[in-house]
Interface confidence: low
């Protein structure tokens, strides 16, 4: 199939983190199973976002197990390269910019910034350190970039990309992944699920920071880590709000210019890292 080799230089409306998995089993941990054979197999590691080798015992296990590296890549990667994706244009304003400041329920009293929709500017507030909402930025700069209008009435994204008012050309200033997609929740939400050392099989949930969802896992009853919740709700409450996900909803922005209004489609430029 010649389509297998087609190039994808532009993809519109791509979702930036969390990673969009092709199949749920790609998110499963490598499972060697209870048998004792030593068989070289491959699994997709959601933390490194690569297919990796593991030793399979020969029975049971799960679907995240492939006989070859190629098969693993085909099933679990969106294409045969890792992508660093940068947005070249951003939507008018993310919905969370319109949320009221929310200090949360903790008592950390950290200086943060929020976009005040009344004054149409970013302002400082005291954040308690947990919960709250996504209208919460570590720096004034970040808040301004995401929620305020640019100096000429249009948005500037976190790469400093601007729409040139003269010729509509896109001018990316930087290629770093924006802090917009950093995790602002508790650090343990970023740790992998850990079964622990005992022999129980308790239904628990952990926050999968790569796919941005709470997923079930079996807890052994002791040990493990703090990314371990008795309910999905508890997991989401603790971890989900810390991940600022996608900015683009409809994939269209309006540029505020004196002449006619124009709609510009979001495009994503991809830089391929051939390390798989």
């Amino acid at each position: 199939d010649s389509e297998e080799d087609e190039e994808h230089t532009i993809i519109t409306d791509t979702e930036l983190p969390p990673l969009k998995l092709m199949h749920s089993f790609c998110a499963f941990k490598a499972d060697d199973g209870p048998c004792k054979a030593i068989m070289k197999r491959f699994f997709f590691n959601i933390f490194t976002r690569q297919c990796e080798e593991f030793i399979y015992g020969g029975c049971e296990g799960n679907q995240n197990r492939f006989e070859s590296l190629e098969e693993c890549k085909k099933m679990c990667t969106r294409d045969n390269a890792n992508r660093i994706i940068k947005t070249t244009l951003q939507q008018e304003k993310p919905d969370f910019c319109f949320l009221e400041e929310d200090p949360g329920i903790c008592r950390g009293y950290i200086t943060r910034y929020f976009y005040n929709n009344q004054t149409k500017q970013c302002e400082r507030f005291k954040y308690g350190g947990c919960l709250g909402n996504m209208n919460n930025f570590e720096t004034l700069e970040e808040c301004k970039n995401i929620c305020e209008d640019g100096p000429n009435g249009f948005q500037v994204d976190n790469y400093g990309t601007q729409l040139n008012a003269v010729n509509n050309s896109l001018t990316p200033q930087s290629t770093k992944v924006p802090s917009l997609f950093e995790f602002h929740g508790p650090s343990w939400c970023l740790t992998p699920a850990d079964r622990g050392l005992c022999r129980a099989n308790e239904n628990r949930f952990y926050y999968n920071s790569v796919i941005g969802k709470c997923r079930p896992f079996k807890y052994s009853g002791c040990g493990g880590n703090e990314n371990n919740f008795t309910s999905k709700q508890e997991c989401l409450r603790a971890c989900k709000k810390g991940f600022i996900q996608r900015i683009s909803k409809g994939g269209l922005i309006k540029t505020k210019r004196k002449r006619k209004k124009q709609r510009v489609k979001i495009a994503y430029e991809e830089i391929f890292v051939k390390n798989m």
Epitope: K20, M22, H23, S24
Partner: antibody, heavy 119, light 107 residues
């Protein structure tokens, strides 16, 4: 509005072939996998195959692998199911469904196309 | 393959009743269960995914729950338009498999 429209069904003799088409519209085609699911008359649902439009990666129900082939044409926003060596028991309504990775479920379905295998 | 068993092929109910449709998996599917509704002559419609999350536009009288091998779809107050076939499906591993269906009908 998301729409999936199947076509290509009809009457075919045992041992014959048929190619079903699924035309997708109302969303970015490469953002979601597409699946084929079939339903024999008066029976339940049976998953057939899945394709990722970006790289063409496929998953099959082993029961159909070798006889059925799923493919896609991104330029036409379409997915296909090539069915060979058809048998009477392949008689069914064949549905195309959008597989939403975040849900791990099929969130939009076409109206289905009837395939009848009979001599 | 994982077998999804819906033990009741038919369930009789009346408008306003609370009804629970059950589904049992042949092995633990870790809440990777979806529920679909299918009316005569129509294609299936997604109601619930990940065992308990309602799909957009689905009335809140539909709720899903369960873990391990046992899953339930509950309609808290049956409406006339709810009379249909209901299928559970596991998406834990391929081949994705459906239950045989439960037909909800009027008493």
């Amino acid at each position: 509005e998301v729409q999936l429209v199947e076509s290509g069904g009809g009457l075919v003799q045992p041992g014959g072939s048929l190619r079903l088409s699924c035309a997708a519209s109302g969303y970015t085609f490469t953002d979601y996998n597409l699946d084929w699911v079939r339903q024999a008359p008066g029976k339940g649902l049976e998953w057939v195959a899945d394709i990722n439009p970006i790289n063409g990666a496929t998953l099959y129900n082993q029961k159909f692998k070798g006889r059925f082939t799923i493919s896609r044409d991104n330029a036409k926003n379409s997915a296909y199911l090539q069915m060979n060596s058809l048998r009477a028991e392949d008689t069914a309504v064949y549905y195309c469904a959008r597989y939403y990775g975040d849900y791990d479920a099929m969130d939009y379905w076409g109206q289905g196309t009837l395939v009848t295998v009979s001599s | 393959d994982i077998v999804m068993t819906q033990s009741h092929k038919f369930m009789s109910t009346s408008v306003g009743d609370r009804v629970s449709i059950t589904c049992k998996a042949s092995q633990d599917v870790h809440t990777a269960v979806a529920w679909y509704q299918q009316k005569p002559g129509q294609s299936p419609r997604l109601l619930i995914y990940w065992a308990s999350t309602r799909h957009t536009g689905v009335p809140d009288r539909f709720t899903g729950c369960g873990s391990g091998t046992d899953y339930t779809l509950t309609i808290s107050s049956v409406q006339a338009e709810d009379l249909a076939l209901y299928y559970c499906q596991q998406h834990y591993t391929t081949p994705y498999t459906f239950g045989g269906g439960t037909k909800l009908e009027m008493k």
